[in-house]
Every structure is written in C-alpha cells, then in structure tokens.
C-alpha cells in the first residue's frame, strides 16, 4: 500500500499499471482516444483514479512536457468559480476562456483552457501506484 497518502501525495510504491506512466509519486494515464468531459471522468473513476487534479505550478510544468498542442481534459470545472474535482480552488494558474458555455477545464503544452464540456478531447487520469486510497 501507499503509506500516509493524502489528496496530493503518494509515498514510494510499486510501479504503475500497463499504459500508465509513473512520474514522481503518481501514475498518469494519457488517453489515445477522445471523450467528452463526463465520459472521461467516468473512465478514470472506473480505474480507481480521477481526472487529473494538478496541485501546483511545478506539477503542471512537469506534465506539460508530455503534452502537445492538443488539449486534454482534466479534473477542473467552473461551478461559480474554477474548482478542481477535489474541491480546491484553481489558484496557481490562469485559465483562458471566451464563453459562458466553457465550464470544463483542459490542458495542453501552453497552459489551461476552458472548453464546453461536450467536446471530445483526450484526457489525463491520475492515481497513486496500485493499491492506494487517494484519488488525487
């Protein structure tokens, strides 16, 4: 088990499942296919993970190395303010938006972007390696 885990950290643990990438103390899954935001969330939850919640600028910068111009869904939504799926507010980065219908968050190599939630995009799941209670 990952010991002493919480919403943002995992202890050193075994490697990640197939097709998941280990980075720091977490496993990340970068999808090949595209889904809308809700379907992407469901995909992650079904694999004991969650749509990517980024804890700080450092993690964001590290992840952006693996991203292209193509946007990927992350666990960020605008519900009377931009919040991560763990309930924490977005406070370390700006998100670009141009419309009231853009209430879901995505990321690419250049930063965060709001999008309408029904658009099919790639997505990123995050979890602790193998058996762990933490989702974020």
């Amino acid at each position: 088990l990952c010991q002493g885990s919480n919403y943002s950290t995992c202890a050193s643990c075994p490697s990640c499942p197939d097709r998941w990438m280990k980075y720091g103390n977490h496993c990340y899954y970068f999808s090949v296919e595209e889904k809308d935001w809700n379907s992407s969330l469901e995909f992650c939850l079904a694999r004991d993970s969650h749509l990517l919640v980024i804890t700080d600028n450092q993690e964001m910068s590290l992840l952006q190395v693996f991203l292209s111009e193509a946007f990927c869904w992350i666990g960020l939504r605008n519900n009377s303010g931009w919040r991560w799926e763990d309930g924490s507010p977005l406070n370390f980065s700006r998100i670009s938006s141009n419309s009231f219908v853009q209430t879901c968050g995505a990321i690419n190599k250049n930063g965060l972007q709001a999008s309408s939630c029904e658009v099919p995009l790639h997505w990123v799941c995050k979890k602790c390696p193998f058996a762990d209670q933490a989702l974020f």
Partner: antibody, heavy 122, light 107 residues
Framework: DVKLVESGGGLVKLGGSLKLSCAAS????????MSWVRQTPEKRLEWVAT????????YYPDTVKGRFTISRDSAKNTLYLQMSSLNSEDTAVYFC???????????????WGQGTSVTVSS | DIQMTQSPSSLSASLGERVSLTCRAS??????LNWLQQEPDGTIKRLIY???SLDSGVPKRFSGSRSGSDYSLTISSLESEDFVYYYC?????????FGAGTKLELK
C-alpha cells in the same frame, strides 16, 4: 442559406403557458448550439436560453430558470421553448438564433430568425 | 451580472460621416463581444463577433475595436441603410447581456 422561422407566439393569460418553435434550415442543425433571445416593447434585448448541439446542456438566466425549458429535435431540425407561469414581463418578441461552439472558441448568435410575438395579458 | 453600458442612446449623423458607438463592460469580458444591427422591420443581423471580426457579407466600412473595457463599433462612411438600431452583446459570462441600443438617425 441559413433560415430560422419562429412560430407559436400569441396572446396568453397571466400564469399561462405557451410553446414556441423555431424551424431551422440551410445548415446542419445538429452541429450548432441554439438560443432564444427576446425583445421587450421598450426594445431591450434579453437572453432567454441556450442549448448545446446534443441537447444535453442547457443554460438559462435566473429570470426564466424553472419556468422556461429549451429543447430541440434534431430529426425535425426544430428548436423549442416551453414557457410556463408567464407574467407581464415576459411580453416580448421572441427570436431564435444560432450559435457555434468549437470547444475553446464560441461564436454567439450569428444568425437570427424574424421573431414571434408573445403578449401576456391579465 | 455584467452590465453593458452603450452610448450614445441615439446619434444624428450625415451621409458619408464617420461615427463610433461604444459599449463599456462592467467586468472583464476578454473580447467576447458582438455588434448587432436591427432593421426597422425587426430583422437582426450580426455585424462583428469577438470584438473585431467582420461577419461575411458585412461591408468593410464597419469595424470593431477594443480599448480596455471599452468596445467600439465604427462606421467609416455612413450610407443610407446604416440608419438603424445597433446593439452590443457580451457572451463571456452568464447571463448574456446586451447594451441598451443606439438609434442612428439621419441628420
């Protein structure tokens, strides 16, 4: 040519209900968000509702939330607005309009219908 | 809600004259603004979207610009068919809100 034709307006009693329709042609209806906007007798424009291309997402201002329902039938290329608990402030000309969503960019209200008049009387 | 303060409410001008209408946004709308034209018969047409992009078929005499929270529609040389109503619309934030309108009249 893009064409939007509203119908269903008329005189309705205070507290009554009415359903407006908007027949769309000249574009792929299922690819576009659609909206309803009204114009009061004082010529003020007010946004009423927006629906996504799939119909899964709907958006309303607080003034009509819970009273009005926007819906669409892509097989019939038709947009609807079901209005209930109507009051005098709902008296207006109701326009349907087309919106385009590209995910990260949104083009609001690019084509408009000619409008249908709704009068709420006591 | 974001208030869109449109000015002037009416404007008298001559054929060939250059005029500007302005909408001031009470909060940041990041350029998410359209300009609409309404003819006497009620027909509404979008002229400009996203602050400065001209819709297809709209004459080049129409242009849009931004300075901070002020958004402007400029008509470089007025023609007879331009003497109608104009509205701005912000779509950055819900609810969508419109300016109160400008009536352009022939002097």
């Amino acid at each position: 040519d893009v064409k939007l034709v509203e119908s269903g307006g008329g005189l309705v009693k205070l507290g009554g209900s009415l359903k407006l329709s908007c027949a769309a042609s000249g574009f792929t209806f299922s690819s576009y968000y659609m909206s309803w906007v009204r114009q009061t007798p004082e010529k003020r424009l007010e946004w009423v509702a927006t629906i996504s291309n799939s119909g899964r997402s709907t958006y309303y201002p607080d003034t009509v939330k819970g009273r009005f329902t926007i819906s669409r039938d892509s097989a019939k290329n038709t947009l609807y607005l079901q209005m209930s608990s109507l009051n005098s402030e709902d008296t207006a000309v109701y326009f349907c309009a087309r919106d385009r969503d590209y995910g990260y960019t949104y083009e609001a209200l690019d084509y408009w219908g000619q409008g249908t008049s709704v009068t709420v009387s006591s | 809600d974001i208030q869109m303060t449109q000015s002037p409410s009416s404007l008298s001008a001559s054929l060939g004259e250059r005029v500007s209408l302005t909408c001031r946004a009470s909060q940041d709308i990041g350029g998410s603004l359209n300009w609409l034209q309404q003819e006497p018969d009620g027909t509404i047409k979008r002229l400009i979207y996203a602050t400065s992009s001209l819709d297809s078929g709209v004459p080049k005499r129409f242009s849009g610009s931004r300075s901070g929270s002020d958004y402007s529609l400029t008509i470089s040389s007025l023609e007879s068919e331009d003497f109608v109503y104009y509205y701005c619309l912000q779509y950055a934030s819900s609810p969508l809100t419109f300016g109160a309108g400008t009536k352009l009249e022939l002097k």
